[in-house]
Interface confidence: medium
């Protein structure tokens, strides 16, 4: 044992940090970190802030240990936010707005632009900002399946809350399907769970982006936080690089 060389953990740590720093810089196509002087003045763009806030709020509620990622997934993913098609779009006219459900449609061309191939998608989350909720609500999420049918995906019991909160549904499989087929617009439905003992089957929860009669300036902010799909995918060039390095091995 005396012949064993002691490991300088500090050095290992520094090298590891350098490696990660290098990966981040290459991902950003930068040779070195930008200096403070290069940081643009003024507030962050609304879209960046909204994405940060929704992620921060979700992470705050999570305490489970993350699963170890396979080597291919260790490297940076590209994260894209695709907003729901606005509610004044004609697609919504085909679906009778009811007190029981809300509908959320997405433009698949925007999804394909973000993720060109289904295999590149590692995770897709549907994120909704729920507003104050006075009573408990059991909700169910459905995927638009064919002309007049909906496929059940999952359910959630929402506890009463006096402040806004982000809800997140894992819809990876559904988005992969959408990327594989040729549809132009695909959608989800959020409905109140129907049960014999519930007070009524009205969707009590108020989801940001669906409330009408808002002042113009508030409507813009409201629209920024309307439901969206958060896509995490391996960039095409990174996937190709991984593929070729596997062949070399």
């Amino acid at each position: 044992l005396s012949t064993c060389k002691t490991i300088d953990m500090e050095l290992v740590k520094r090298k590891r940090i350098e490696a990660i720093r290098g990966q981040i810089l290459s991902k950003l196509r930068l040779a070195s970190p930008p200096s403070q002087g290069e940081v643009p003045p003024g507030p962050l763009p609304e879209a960046v802030l909204a994405l940060y806030n929704s992620t921060r709020d979700r992470v705050a509620g999570e305490s489970a240990e993350p699963e170890p990622e396979p080597e291919a997934d260790y490297y940076a993913k590209e994260v894209t936010r695709v907003l729901m098609v606005e509610t004044h779009n004609e697609i919504y006219d085909k679906f009778k707005q009811s007190t029981h459900s809300i509908y959320m449609f997405f433009n698949t061309s925007e999804l394909r632009e973000a993720v060109p191939e289904p295999v590149l998608l590692s995770r897709a989350e549907l994120r909704l900002l729920r507003l104050k909720l006075k009573v408990e609500q059991h909700v169910e999420l459905y995927q638009k399946y064919s002309n007049n049918s909906w496929r059940y995906l999952s359910n959630r019991l929402l506890a009463p809350s006096d402040s806004p909160e982000w809800l997140s549904f894992d819809v990876t499989g559904v988005v992969r399907q959408w990327l594989s087929r040729g549809g132009e617009i695909e959608g989800f439905r959020l409905s109140a769970h129907c049960s014999c003992d519930s007070r009524d089957n009205t969707l009590q929860v108020d989801i940001n982006g669906f409330t009408t009669g808002r002042r113009g300036d508030l409507a813009t902010i409201h629209g920024m936080n309307r439901p969206f799909l958060l896509l995490m995918a391996t960039p095409l060039e990174r996937a190709q690089h991984l593929q070729s390095s596997r062949h070399r091995r």
Epitope: A60, A159, P160, R199
Partner: antibody, heavy 117, light 108 residues
Framework: VEESGGRLVTPGTPLTLTCTVS????????MNWVRQAPGKGLEWIGY?????TTYHANWARGRFTISKTSTTVDLKMTSLTTEDTATYFC????????????????WGPGTLVTVSS | AFELTQTPSSVEAAVGGTVTIKCQAS??????LAWYQQRPGQPPKLLIY???TLASGVPSRFKGSGSGTDFTLTISDLECADAATYFC??????????FGGGTKVEIK
């Protein structure tokens, strides 16, 4: 369930009360804070759900904040006035059914907060 | 604003007798009402929830009834240990969680 942190403070002083639980998990039960002024009735302040979601009484919103760790529930109070002098109770929601976050089956002995100049 | 009115504020009864306490809500709360007993110097104790369901370990001498806006707690075969203040509580939704003013029960 046991409350701590109650003491004599001057008006305007912030104060945090802590409720420590054992024998059950905060990931399974909602917790409530209720107060009782000397010789008066009970007043619900708010609750925190298993997920960390909170709901406060209208009068308490903005001045009282409930948060939690794995074994404790905190009540943070700001801008205290003499009207806030009371025994503060921490109480567990029954968990009998999902609707009953606010039906309280296990109470702490309470901690006394006195606000006086 | 939502209000819960409890009557009477105090009542006196003999051992073995019966006491009736009323609780009225300013709007319908279905059966989302609970009753608590608080003895001097102690925290409250849950007696009844869902207007009429007895909590675990509570004797059947305690009976809750009512729905909508009018509720009643009846204590029969009164014992000395029943001397306490009783509170009703509404929990229909987040904005209507609250307690009645309380009824002090004294045993002669």
């Amino acid at each position: 369930v046991e409350e701590s942190g109650g003491r004599l403070v001057t008006p305007g002083t912030p104060l945090t009360l802590t409720c420590t639980v054992s024998g059950f998990s905060l990931s399974s039960y909602a917790m409530n804070w209720v107060r009782q002024a000397p010789g008066k009735g009970l007043e619900w302040i708010g609750y925190i759900y298993t997920s960390g979601t909170t709901y406060h009484a209208n009068w308490a919103r903005g001045r009282f904040t409930i948060s939690k760790t794995s074994t404790t529930v905190d009540l943070k109070m700001t801008s205290l006035t003499t009207e806030d002098t009371a025994t503060y109770f921490c109480a567990r929601g029954t968990g009998i059914s999902d609707y009953y976050y606010w039906v309280m089956d296990l109470w702490g002995p309470g901690t006394l907060v006195t606000v006086s100049s | 604003a939502f209000e819960l009115t409890q009557t009477p504020s105090s009542v006196e009864a003999a051992v073995g007798g019966t006491v009736t306490i009323k609780c009225q809500a300013s709007q319908s709360i279905s059966t989302y009402l609970a009753w608590y007993q608080q003895r001097p110097g102690q925290p409250p104790k849950l007696l009844i929830y869902k207007a009429s369901t007895l909590a675990s370990g509570v004797p059947s001498r305690f009976k809750g009834s009512g729905s909508g806006t009018d509720f009643t707690l009846t204590i029969s075969d009164l014992e000395c240990a029943d001397a306490a203040t009783y509170f009703c509580q509404s929990y229909c939704d987040g904005d209507s969680v609250g307690f009645g003013g309380g009824t002090k029960v004294e045993i002669k």
